[in-house]
């Protein structure tokens, strides 16, 4: 039946793929910063807000030096999938107060989805092992009140901003090693 299939084809210049991913990540970081600022103006936060269902921050900036490409991309993809799910949940269950953040929240969701597809493409172009299919995540409980939805929005956007900031630094560092 012919020769066995060769290894996955790596793109001629993986750095170009990584560049494209950095640009998308940086753009999403700025979008998130601006949307978080808008949220703080509309619904001022009383201190920091946390949400137990959000991923913990992947890495401190100081520990970036020890990172390896497969680990970074796998972890980043998992965390961003979680944030995508939380943004979808926020738009669906966040209550009428958060409707004032549309269409920006919808744009953020679309760009987050696009970045996730870009990461998937990058992983296949770099011939990295594909992560197993994601197990079905337990559904997120609706916020207990309108203010609960607002607190969740602060936590989600704050966490996403930190994650994307880490991601930009990590991706730029990894680019130098390719």
């Amino acid at each position: 039946p012919g020769p066995p299939p060769g290894p996955p084809r790596v793109s001629p210049d993986p750095r170009a793929e990584l560049d494209s991913t950095v640009l998308l990540t940086r753009s999403l970081l700025a979008d998130t910063r601006q949307l978080a600022a808008q949220l703080r103006d509309k619904f001022p936060a009383d201190g920091d807000h946390n949400l137990d269902s959000l991923p913990t921050l992947a890495m401190s900036a100081g520990a970036l030096g020890a990172l390896q490409l497969p680990g970074v991309l796998t972890r980043l993809r998992a965390d961003l999938l979680s944030y995508l799910r939380h943004v979808q949940w926020l738009r669906r269950a966040g209550g009428s107060s958060l409707k004032t953040l549309e269409p920006e929240l919808g744009t953020l969701q679309a760009r987050l989805d696009r970045l996730l597809r870009r990461l998937q493409l990058l992983m296949s172009r770099l011939a990295l092992p594909q992560p197993p299919p994601d197990p079905p995540a337990p559904p997120l409980a609706p916020p207990s009140s309108a203010w609960g939805g607002i607190r969740a929005a602060h936590a989600i956007l704050g966490g996403l901003h930190l994650t994307l900031d880490w991601a930009v630094r990590g991706l730029l560092l990894l680019k130098t090693r390719l």
């Epitope: 640009l23 940086r26 753009s27 700025a30 910063r33 601006q34 949307l35 600022a37 703080r40 103006d41």
Partner: antibody
């Protein structure tokens, strides 16, 4: 027509304080983030600070952090920059600038500037 | 901090000639966060081109912008006497927002 008019500049001794104002007209002031940008004599542009429409997010350049405070009064259509512990290197023309659209953080419209001179 | 480096520092040309000004960015930035400003002596800067290639209101068609990633360009297709000024590029993707050091466009 968008208009931004700065005032409050002048001569101040090192270590002294000054408060700059920017009077805005021709647009809904409470809908736009505002910046202060400065330009030392014969030099380039340096961003100083940014404040969102509702004042709940503020960013500063490292060179002024802890010494300068940006604030606004939407009822008076006014932007302010309180400058403390002034240094010779703060000598510059200070411009206020309005962002292009809400929360985009750009520099679409500029005032004519007010000169701050820090010297003994 | 993202550093913007403009070249050349000074450009000497005659009216009617084409001007090409460069802005090199220390990090990759999305094109929607790169802007150009014009400043004439004794005046405030004014927005010229926003998001790499969009002319601001009232800016003549002879001004155009292009570029991506780390390399951006402002082009003036045929210089008019009023175009001789200092031009600055600026990035808005990252705080602190930063400007290039400027390119002075002078009459030859």
């Amino acid at each position: 027509e968008v208009q931004l008019v700065e005032s409050g500049g002048g001569l101040v001794q090192p270590g002294g304080s000054l408060r700059l104002s920017c009077a805005a007209s021709g647009f809904t002031f409470s809908s736009f983030g505002m910046h202060w940008v400065r330009q030392a004599p014969g030099k380039g542009l340096e961003w100083v600070a940014y404040i969102t429409p509702g004042s709940n997010t503020i960013y500063y350049a490292d060179t002024v952090k802890g010494r300068f405070t940006i604030s606004r009064d939407n009822a008076k259509n006014s932007l302010y920059l309180q400058m403390n512990s002034l240094r010779a290197e703060d000598t510059a023309v200070y411009y206020c600038a309005r962002e292009y659209s809400s929360y985009d953080e750009g520099f679409a419209y500029w005032g004519q500037g007010t000169l701050v001179t820090v010297s003994s | 901090e993202i550093v913007l480096t403009q070249s050349p520092a000074t450009l000497s040309l005659s009216p009617g000639e084409r001007a090409t000004l460069s802005c090199s960015v220390s990090d990759l930035i999305p094109s929607q966060y790169l802007h150009w400003y014009q400043q004439k002596p004794g005046q405030a800067p004014r927005l010229l081109i926003y998001r790499t290639s969009n002319r601001a209101s009232g800016i003549p068609a002879r001004f155009s912008g292009s570029g991506s990633g780390t390399d951006f360009t402002l082009t003036i297709s045929s210089l008019e006497p009023e175009d001789f000024a200092v031009y600055y590029c600026q990035q808005g993707v990252d705080v602190p927002f930063t400007f290039g050091q400027g390119t002075k466009l002078e009459i030859k």
